[in-house]
């Protein structure tokens, strides 16, 4: 697990920078857990980071993720509503210079070290589709969400809006 103090220093540093030419509208340091209260954890193994979904022991510290929120204009010709809309996009970074990425070919979620500007694969459209839970939809692949599969994070295709409340794509954010 990553040390929280490093993430807090990183949070301060990020406030002075910008990503993809725009600054986040806000940032939030939080632990990420599933709808069923399993923790999302990050571990360094063989010089690469692995992401796990697991039950933590009683006093075990939860890993924190820096969520950076961006406002994105959605033109009316894409929205189909005849009006321009805004949506929230997030990037998720558990440690300095590493961000969660959507690997659409492998249907996997990976931690990549990257330079700014961040690639589109690092951005997720934020949904709150269920009381106090959020979901993360791939910017690069609409209808595909970060989800839980076999105790790992994976990309899961959601076929219709009725399935957006399916538990395996719902996550909780907590400051504790």
């Amino acid at each position: 697990a990553f040390g929280i103090s490093g993430v807090q220093k990183y949070t301060r540093a990020l406030h002075d920078s910008s990503i993809t030419g725009i600054s986040p509208i806000t940032e939030y340091l939080a632990s990420l857990s599933t709808y069923n209260d399993q923790s999302i954890t990050f571990a360094l193994e063989d010089e690469s980071y692995e992401i796990y979904v697991e039950d933590l022991k009683k006093d075990e510290k939860k890993d924190k993720v820096l969520l950076s929120y961006y406002e994105s204009q959605h033109p009316s010709n894409e929205s189909g509503d005849g009006v321009d809309g805004k949506m929230l996009m997030v990037t998720l970074s558990p440690t300095k210079d590493f961000w969660l990425h959507a690997n659409n070919k492998e249907h996997s979620v990976e931690l990549h070290k990257c330079e700014k500007p961040l690639p589109d694969q690092a951005f997720f459209v934020l949904h709150n589709m269920h009381s106090n839970c959020v979901s993360f939809e791939c910017k690069t692949d609409p209808g595909v969400f970060i989800g839980v599969k076999d105790n790992h994070l994976a990309l899961i295709k959601v076929d219709s809006s009725e399935n957006l409340c399916t538990e395996n794509i719902l996550f909780k954010l907590s400051e504790t």
Epitope: I25, K86, L88, M129, C165
Partner: antibody, heavy 121, light 107 residues
Framework: QVQLQESGPGLVKPSETLSLTCTVS????????VHWIRQPPGKGLEWLGV???????GYNSALMSRLTISKDSSKSQVSLKLSSVTAADTAVYYC???????????????WGQGTLVTVSS | DIQMTQSPSSVSASVGDRVTITCLAS??????LAWYQQKPGKSPKLLIY???RLADGVPSRFSGSGSGTDFTLTISSLQPEDFATYYC?????????FGQGTKVEIK
Amino acid sequence: QVQLQESGPGLVKPSETLSLTCTVSGFSLSKYGVHWIRQPPGKGLEWLGVLRAGGSTGYNSALMSRLTISKDSSKSQVSLKLSSVTAADTAVYYCVRDHYYYSSYGGFVYWGQGTLVTVSS
Amino acid sequence: DIQMTQSPSSVSASVGDRVTITCLASQTIGAWLAWYQQKPGKSPKLLIYAATRLADGVPSRFSGSGSGTDFTLTISSLQPEDFATYYCQQLDSSPYTFGQGTKVEIK
């Protein structure tokens, strides 16, 4: 352009069910959440509940046992039903739309004009 | 549920004055706070969202600050059309509770 219009009876008898409809235009209920908010005469705003873009609902905990919010997407309508009403439910009822697609974090830009419902025998 | 406490409940001010309204959340809500202005007989109007973001068409004399539990709405130079009631609302978690309102009156 975006519009929300509340409709329903202006007078409801105590113990009966208050039923209101919000008819929306200029946006899709599959992309934006619609909320109900009320304001008793001379008082502040009270959030009642939401029908989210994904179809799930959220309610004010104090009213949860009496409140139901549902939608008819084909008519672009969101309905509110509040059962067992008393004089304390007399208020202007507003329906409002989320600022952001798929998310309530951005507050509410678009409001209906509100409809006054009086509970009295 | 998260409680939102606004202060003061009313303020008397003159045109040109700087007016500050505060909102205190009973638990941390990140930056997910909105401010609304309401005039008698009218629907509320969104002024500020995400604690600091000015809604479209809102004059720049309005500004928002804060994060976590403490938030402020500032009107830098009060104009005649600003006399109204102002509400904060937390949007971090459902139920999305409002503050009790602050009435800005003419001195």
